[in-house]
Structure formats: structure tokens, C-alpha cells
Amino acid sequence: SPEVWVQVQMEATNLSSFSVHCGVLGYSLISLVTVSCEGFVDAGRTKLAVLHPEFGTQQWAPARQAHWETPNSVSVTLTMGQSKARSSLANTTFCCEFVTFPHGSRVACRDLHRSDPGLSAPTPALNLQAD
């Protein structure tokens, strides 16, 4: 069964820009990837990007760019004001959902307030499975 991972990387030189990386491990056909966050703009879940293998990508602010990094992983770059970034990120959770065949939907989330200050430590992602 495929396993989804999530990692967040903050740019060392620019605190207002950071990237969410996520991917799936194992043998599966990827049909759609959705990257979202909670606790960032408001209490609800905000869709940041949708990536389709054939039809390309779509992203919404504050996501600036979304792209495939490998056939099994994607990256979404977010940009915002520096002060807003510092205050907002503390309570933000980023989630990645991979819709795969034949396994269905796999979601992993990364809870930023439990990460170290650099936000780049490879701590295990929470794996939620919904077929």
C-alpha cells in the first residue's frame, strides 16, 4: 500500500517564501494530487494547488507555483508578507492528498507547530487512509 510523505522547507534567505514537498512511496498510478492547508488563512481548509498528471496544475494564493518534482512527488511554493508568515505558520497544517489507482485516496499532513524552527526536519507525516 502506498505511503504519502510531506515536508516543508523554508528558504534560508527569504523567510516569506517556503515550499511544501510531498510524494508517494510505492507502486501506484497517480491520477490527482491536491495540496491544502488548515489554520493558515482561517479555521477551514484552504486548497493551495491541484496537480493533474496530464492536464497540468492550478494554484491559488498564497501558492505561487506548483509543479511535479518527480513522477511521484510535487512541490508547492508559497509567498506572503514576512510578518504574516511568522504569525500564521505557527498554527498551520499542510496536507497532501494523492488519488491513486488501485489504492484510492491517501492523505498525509504535516503539523508545523510540532516541527523544529527550521521547518525542514524529516519528521514522520501523519498518514490518514481513506479508500
Epitope: 510523505w5 515536508q7 522547507q9 514537498h21 510524494g23 512511496l25 507502486y27 501506484s28 498510478l29 497517480i30 498528471p53 496530464e54 497540468g56 496544475t57 509543479h67 511535479w68 518534482e69 518527480t70 513522477p71 511521484n72 512527488s73 524529516p122
Partner: antibody, heavy 123, light 106 residues
């Protein structure tokens, strides 16, 4: 232009392990996956697995699962492939290659490739 | 795993000939198909990616076509430097290579 330079030839005994390195220069190492492909004498190409350096996560071909470990060191822009429990059938040239794509779709291919490392398994 | 079957496994041709190599996937892979050329003692070289896109610097006599399960690499007019082994590769679910097609001088 990214270049991949691999470590030198190795001669190993059956049952032992080998670790081959692949150093990238001239580009951003962590922004693309590195795959490992092997080719036995007179045979075709076989994908073994690949690693995404940013996360350190690796995917492996089913055939090699449990016997191969692919790692990466971002600080030295180097990827490694370790194959354990070597047997004579593992005698091959081992190549590293960079997963390259356009980004906006899921199309990826291997370019560039390392020069290859010959691993000979013999008692 | 997705199996890739190439045919023929070898062929003999003359300079100027039109050469066609086929690759069949065990299941649909859309257009996630690449072609490589390999010469003895050298690393493979990318020719075609995404089934039909010509890699920069590759001569236009090389072309690729197909989608789903059946793909073709065509060399419109074989040149002396084209005698080599050609491999297809799927990149839809992880990666798999075809068995190769050796193009020899007749």
C-alpha cells in the same frame, strides 16, 4: 549543465556489499531525483530505484526491494547506492541518472547519466 | 509491474534505410514513454521523451509516436552513427525499460 561523476570500479566477494557513489556538479542537486540503473554484461537496462534528495525518500523496483539502499547527502551533492548480499549475477555496470522533467506535467526521463561503475562479483 | 516489450530484439539495416522499432506496454501508460540510444561502453543517451518530443541536439531523422500501449521509434534515413542499441522506458508507474533493439549493419 548538471554532470554526474561516479566512483571507480569495484571487485567484491559473493555475500558482501558494495556502495557506489554519484556526485553531481553544475546544478541544484536537491531539485531532482537521482535514479540508479544497472546493466549486466550483454544485457539490457534495469531500473533499481531512485531517491529525492530534498526529503531523503526513495522508491525501489520490486526486484531489488530489501537488498538495495539508496541514500543522498545534500551537503556533498552525492547520491549512493548500496547493494547487499552480492551474487555473481550482480556483476554489472551501475549507472546513476538524473530524473528530468518539465514540471507542469508528470513526464520525466533520465538525463544526464553518470559514466557508469563496473561492479564485479567473483570468489 | 509494467512490462515493456520491444521488437525486434535485433535488426540488420543499411545506411539510408528507414528503420522502425516498436515498444508495447503491458498496460496503458498514456504518453509516458522515452527512447534512449546506447553505444558499446557508453551510457545511454536520451533521444525522445513523452513519446514524441525530440530531445535537444538529437537529429530530426529520429521521431517517436504512439500512446496507450503501442509506441514506435522511427529513424527516417539510417546514418553510420546510428548503429547502436535502442531502449524504450515507461515513466508512468515508477520506471521500466524494454529489452532493447540492436541495430546492426547489413
Amino acid at each position: 549543465q548538471v554532470q554526474l561523476v561516479q566512483s571507480g570500479a569495484e571487485v567484491k566477494k559473493p555475500g558482501s556489499s558494495v556502495k557506489v557513489s554519484c556526485k553531481a556538479s553544475g546544478g541544484t542537486f536537491s531539485s531532482a531525483a537521482i535514479s540508479w540503473v544497472r546493466q549486466a554484461p550483454g544485457q539490457g537496462l534495469e531500473w533499481m530505484g531512485g531517491i529525492f534528495p530534498i526529503s531523503g525518500h526513495a522508491n525501489y523496483a520490486q526486484k531489488f526491494q530489501g537488498r538495495v539502499t539508496i541514500t543522498a547527502d545534500e551537503s556533498t551533492s552525492t547520491a549512493y547506492m548500496e547493494l547487499s548480499s552480492l551474487r555473481s549475477e550482480d556483476t554489472a555496470v551501475y549507472y546513476c541518472a538524473r530524473d528530468t522533467g518539465r514540471g507542469y506535467t508528470r513526464h520525466f526521463w533520465f538525463d544526464p547519466w553518470g559514466q557508469g561503475t563496473l561492479v564485479t562479483v567473483s570468489s | 509491474d509494467i512490462q515493456m516489450t520491444q521488437s525486434p530484439s535485433s535488426l540488420s539495416a543499411s545506411v539510408g534505410d528507414r528503420v522502425t522499432i516498436t515498444c508495447r506496454a503491458s498496460q496503458s501508460i498514456s504518453s509516458y514513454l522515452n527512447w534512449y540510444q546506447q553505444k558499446p561502453g557508453k551510457a545511454p543517451k536520451l533521444l525522445i521523451y513523452a513519446a514524441s518530443s525530440l530531445q535537444s541536439g538529437v537529429p530530426s531523422r529520429f521521431s517517436g509516436s504512439g500512446s496507450g500501449t503501442d509506441f514506435t521509434l522511427t529513424i527516417s534515413s539510417l546514418q553510420p552513427e546510428d548503429f547502436a542499441t535502442y531502449y524504450c522506458q515507461q515513466s508512468d508507474i515508477l520506471y521500466t525499460f524494454g529489452g532493447g533493439t540492436k541495430v546492426e549493419i547489413k
